[in-house]
Amino acid sequence: NFMYSKTVKRLSKLQEYQQYYPSLTCVMEGKDMEDWSCCPTPWTSFQSSCYFISTVMQSWTKSQNNCSVMGADLVVINTKEEQDFITQNLKINSAYFLGLSDPKGWRHWQWVDQTPYNKNVTFWHSGEPNSPDERCAIINFRSEEWGWNDVHCHVPQKSICKMKKIYI
């Protein structure tokens, strides 16, 4: 009975999410493998988040709006491990917007989800950020490594969206 009611609950939750995400990819996790964590297909998952690489070239504002429509934000990178996971799926000759900007040009960088900007956990390329005119951050491959660079916000780039996993 317990298992049956849990399955019914899951199915109704799945139906609820299906109006937003036509397809979900779920894996069993948790202590007793009783919890399912899901990401929209074809998003990838890492720890408690889902990631989507958008190859549509758009300005930073339009990229953020695009993520928002999907229930996500431009990516907020919190650890080196997270960045390493993300960059496995990026093309080395492309640049991708992050959810990091400095809208007033005061070098007060802020993440879209209001996560505090921690200077000790940043991965700027050497010499970056280098211009208060360039108020949005990208991740790109330079000098044999992935890192961040400040760029003009209105210049179209690819982007990375991030959302919390859906638990059912």
């Epitope: 211009s131 108020r135 209105h154």
Partner: antibody
Framework: EVQLLESGGGLVQPGGSLRLSCAAS????????MSWVRQAPGKGLEWVAT????????YYPDSVKGRFTISRDNSKNTLYLQMNSLRAEDTAVYYC??????????????WGQGTTVTVSS | DIVMTQSPDSLAVSLGERATINCKAS??????????VNWYQQKPGQPPKLLIY???NLESGIPDRFSGSGSGTDFTLTISSLQAEDVAVYYC?????????FGGGTKVEIK
Amino acid sequence: EVQLLESGGGLVQPGGSLRLSCAASGFTFSTYTMSWVRQAPGKGLEWVATINSGGDNTYYPDSVKGRFTISRDNSKNTLYLQMNSLRAEDTAVYYCATYRPYYYGSVLDYWGQGTTVTVSS
Amino acid sequence: DIVMTQSPDSLAVSLGERATINCKASQSVDYDGNSYVNWYQQKPGQPPKLLIYGASNLESGIPDRFSGSGSGTDFTLTISSLQAEDVAVYYCQQSDEDPWTFGGGTKVEIK
């Protein structure tokens, strides 16, 4: 007082090349992003190129990409536009302008008087 | 590309009367409470001059008879009391996304 003085325009044959210059004074040129905008005779305005303050990022519309190159020499307070493979439709007055950011967008706040480029055989 | 459509193409207004110019973007140029539309004035034989930025902010040194309004896709430049020196072509421009694009211009004349 901000001053921008364009030079280098003239008559050139289709397929030819020309280099425009913009001499800047009255502001700290090396800290400003700069742009070129053009205006065909009797027509509207068209953005042509932008370069960031350090000269390491350049941007172009598809209409000139691969043919035009924007560059700058901060030691000489000068902006350049190298125009290759010129076409009749590139005939226009070319203006250089200073770029001022506004949150996630920008404005072109100071403009030079322009230099005329005519592409004709 | 974002297309900026201005109307009317030309406008004849009596001195001291109000002039209104419209600009429509093919998609929204707003984000987080700001609109990325600028207005420029170009007098014959002169370069463009910035009047309004961010849809409604008056550039320093511009007379306050000029004002801008609008959001999303629809924007307006208003000259509250037309003066002889306002005879010019007026352009809207979006800076939300490259390529920056301008409207086709509106010529303002004295009736």
